[in-house]
């Protein structure tokens, strides 16, 4: 199964095939499955693509979709690190305006303590 290990797609794989790429990853890497039409190929990544976070699991780590509302990138299942355009980041969540007592930092789109 590791006979395609010289192929760049097989980098970091524990199991790899010419047709489907990686199906299992080395311990510290994250599995990500690229789907194209009815085909798919796996990759083993050091960090997950935008919109996904690294989920650690007993059998294999994987990238999982960030499902926090109005969030573009997240650190974990419930902690956002970057909000979609037009939304402000506050304590891992995204708001259309900063909560009372917090002011928006336009450069980073984060809510910081202080008066508006």
């Amino acid at each position: 199964r590791a006979s395609y290990v010289s192929n760049p797609i097989c980098k970091g794989c524990l199991s790899c095939s010419k047709d489907n790429g990686c199906s299992r990853c080395q311990q510290k890497l994250f599995f990500f499955l690229r789907r194209e039409g009815m085909r798919q190929y796996g990759e083993c990544l050091h960090s997950c693509p935008s919109g996904y976070y690294g989920h650690r699991a007993p059998d294999m780590n994987r990238c999982a979709r960030c499902r926090i509302e109005n969030c573009d990138s997240c650190f974990s299942k419930d902690f956002c690190t970057k909000c979609k355009v037009g939304f402000y980041l506050h304590r891992g969540r995204c708001f259309d305006e900063c909560p009372d007592g917090f002011a928006p930092l336009e450069e980073t789109m984060e809510c910081v303590e202080g008066c508006e």
Epitope: S15, N20, L33, R35, M38, R65, R67
Partner: antibody, heavy 125, light 107 residues
Framework: EVQLVESGGGLVKPGGSLRLSCAAS????????MSWVRQAPGKGLEWVSS???????YYPDSVKGRFTISRDNAKNSLYLQMNSLRAEDTAVYYC???????????????????WGQGTTVTVSS | DIQMTQSPSSLSASVGDRVTITCKAS??????VAWYQQKPGKAPKLLIY???TRHTGVPSRFSGSGSGTDFTLTISSLQPEDFATYYC?????????FGQGTKVEIK
């Protein structure tokens, strides 16, 4: 609470048509892929069709060209148009959330996480 | 198509027993396997996805493991409400395919 309610099943002759509906509530319907899965009497589960949140459709060879999956996000509804029905299409048809073959999620939506109670389709002369 | 073969097809067990159901894929499916529970006349319910992640509200007595081609569903201490049929499903590549089911009956 996620709820899926199927309707439209019934008795139809071989070669006939039927349209199944699934009314969804308790979640943002337009954001999720949806699927149909069937179960013939006394048998196991068989995937019938999936539709992505963006409207891309997927079918196994057994129903391709005969069945059409569609959705109406404004009505929070999923449909399955079944044409040229055969005796082997007799089954309970379940509507389920998730199961998009075109997108990797790495979470519950890759499986089918909520199912309706099913609607029975009988194809017999 | 990827075939999913479950064993055993049925088993008899008592309340409190540890029950193990296995599922073998005909080719490597990474960790993309889900497990469902179905009671007579009812819809299936998702228990486990991505081989080992429990779905919301699923009791901790249910656990899944495996990767590649060999997968296991374990019920650590069988409860009266666990008597049902269990199905595995691969969500790696289409067509999505299910195992034939394992019926867990009361001894």
């Amino acid at each position: 609470e996620v709820q899926l309610v199927e309707s439209g099943g019934g008795l139809v002759k071989p070669g006939g048509s039927l349209r199944l509906s699934c009314a969804a509530s308790g979640f943002t319907f337009s954001s999720y892929a949806m699927s149909w899965v069937r179960q013939a009497p006394g048998k196991g589960l068989e995937w019938v069709s999936s539709i992505s949140s963006g409207g891309s459709t997927y079918y196994p060879d057994s129903v391709k060209g005969r069945f059409t999956i569609s959705r109406d996000n404004a009505k929070n509804s999923l449909y399955l148009q079944m044409n040229s029905l055969r005796a082997e299409d007799t089954a309970v048809y379940y509507c389920a959330r998730g199961g998009d073959p075109g997108v990797y999620n790495g979470d519950y939506e890759d499986a089918m996480d909520y199912w309706g109670q099913g609607t029975t389709v009988t194809v017999s002369s | 198509d990827i075939q999913m073969t479950q064993s055993p097809s049925s088993l008899s067990a008592s309340v409190g027993d540890r029950v193990t159901i296995t599922c073998k894929a005909s080719q490597d499916v990474s960790s993309a396997v889900a497990w469902y529970q179905q009671k007579p006349g009812k819809a299936p319910k998702l228990l486990i996805y991505w081989a080992s992640t429990r779905h919301t509200g699923v009791p901790s007595r249910f656990s899944g493991s495996g990767s590649g081609t060999d997968f296991t569903l374990t019920i650590s201490s069988l409860q009266p409400e666990d008597f049902a049929t269990y199905y595995c499903q691969q969500h790696y590549s289409t067509p999505w395919t299910f195992g034939q089911g394992t019926k867990v009956e009361i001894k």
